[in-house]
Amino acid sequence: PKQTLPKPIIRAESTYMVPKEKQATLCCQGSYGAVEYQLHFEGSLFAVERPKPPERINGVKFHIPDMNSRKAGRYSCIYRVGELWSERSDLLDLVVTEMYDTPTLSVHPGPEVTSGEKVTFYCRLDTATSMFLLLKEGRSRDVQRSYGKVQAEFPMGPVTTAHRGSYRCFGSYNNYAWSFPSEPVKLLVTGDIENTSLAPTDPTFPDSWDTCLLTRETGLQKDLALWDHTAQNLLR
């Protein structure tokens, strides 16, 4: 069997949801000594980066200017050390937002509820779309999808204090082209006295791993390179 290097980690810098006409930045974290990184879009070669000097840096950034619906979709990356190529990274979905219109988000029975009540979010967008998405701020990877002609429902609950937070919704014209975000709706959940501290699922800071952790190698980092790679995989 042909020998391959471990797969790199691909991630979006700051967010995978990029407003149209803005720049997206994707990071491919591979290995010290990699001489070439390739970014693939929908299975085809999209861009190439060669780090300088290759032995001193463990990844590269790919800048995608002027984001639009043609550049939205599934990205992956690979890298090369000498003649040896890595396995392909996992796929990253890059989404373009701020397309067309702005939906409105409402919540039933209201934004202030007590623990144990059931809650439903309603996202409405009058222009033609069939898919709607609900995101909790700080948890943008946990996307809920629902379908409807001009409106979709997102039932939740019975809620606990872990559901507290700000929510936004989007209309989606395809999987990778989303509308402007709605105004946020802040859900306040009272009660649940024995569980008023931060629940394990509550983020302590927003989208905390959507950052590029590329490092330049020092003596110490050489020893930590393997650990760094393993830790990143664990974080994902």
Partner: antibody
């Protein structure tokens, strides 16, 4: 305090339509859901649907989808329910109810369908 | 649709007596349940929301509780104005549904 003003009664002919009004005061009209509920004489209560004045989001009981249409006029803080193709089965008291948890109830409008 | 089975349909009781009305939900509704009171003139008032929260201005003799899928309204000591109709209402899942009602009559 919260007030929901509904006309006392409406007399309509079979096959016709009627538009019931519910004028809200004493709270921010656009912040809360408005529900509509039906009660036939001597019977129980039936939920027709609800509308959110700010977003325009609506949710109907499937049973009333082809019978009732909910709208709002934000400028006058008034909710409306239009009932179409009326029959004797539509003779009932119709309540508007403000707040997602059905907190405040109007006095109801008695709709009588009669030739 | 969620069915709310309310019992009893009518209840005769005396002044000062303690009574309980029950609603059983056919599906999980969490704590999304109200108790409503309807006067003979048609006026409807909410007494309890979210299973056990008392509305402001409602006398403390009214209380709400839950045991599994059974929800109860208890009146600890009946007064003359309590002899009216009562309904439960689930607002967990649309279409929102009401119990069939309990007529509380004076013995």
């Amino acid at each position: 305090q919260v007030q929901l003003q509904q006309p006392g009664a409406e007399l309509v002919k079979p096959g016709a339509s009627v538009k019931l009004s519910c004028k809200a005061s004493g709270y921010t009209f656009t912040s809360y859901w408005m529900h509509w509920v039906k009660q036939r004489p001597g019977q129980g209560l039936e939920w027709i649907g609800m509308i959110h004045p700010n977003s325009g989001s609506t949710n109907y009981n499937e049973k009333f989808k082809s019978k009732a249409t909910l709208t709002v006029d934000k400028s006058s803080s008034t909710a409306y329910m239009q009932l179409s193709s009326l029959t004797s089965e539509d003779s009932a008291v119709y309540y508007c109810v403000y707040d997602g948890r059905f907190a405040y109830w109007g006095q109801g409008t008695l709709v009588t369908v009669s030739a | 649709d969620i069915q709310m089975t309310q019992s009893p349909s009518s209840l005769s009781a005396s002044l000062g007596e303690r009574v309980s009305l029950t609603c059983r939900a056919s599906q999980d509704i969490g704590s999304s349940l109200n108790w409503l009171q309807q006067e003979p003139d048609g006026t409807i008032k909410r007494l309890i929301y979210a299973t056990s929260s008392l509305d402001s201005g409602v006398p403390k003799r009214f209380s709400g509780s839950r045991s599994g899928s059974d929800y109860s309204l208890t009146i600890s000591s009946l007064e003359s104005e309590d002899f009216v109709d009562y309904y439960c209402l689930q607002y967990a899942s649309s279409p929102f549904t009401f119990g069939s009602g309990t007529k509380l009559e004076i013995k």
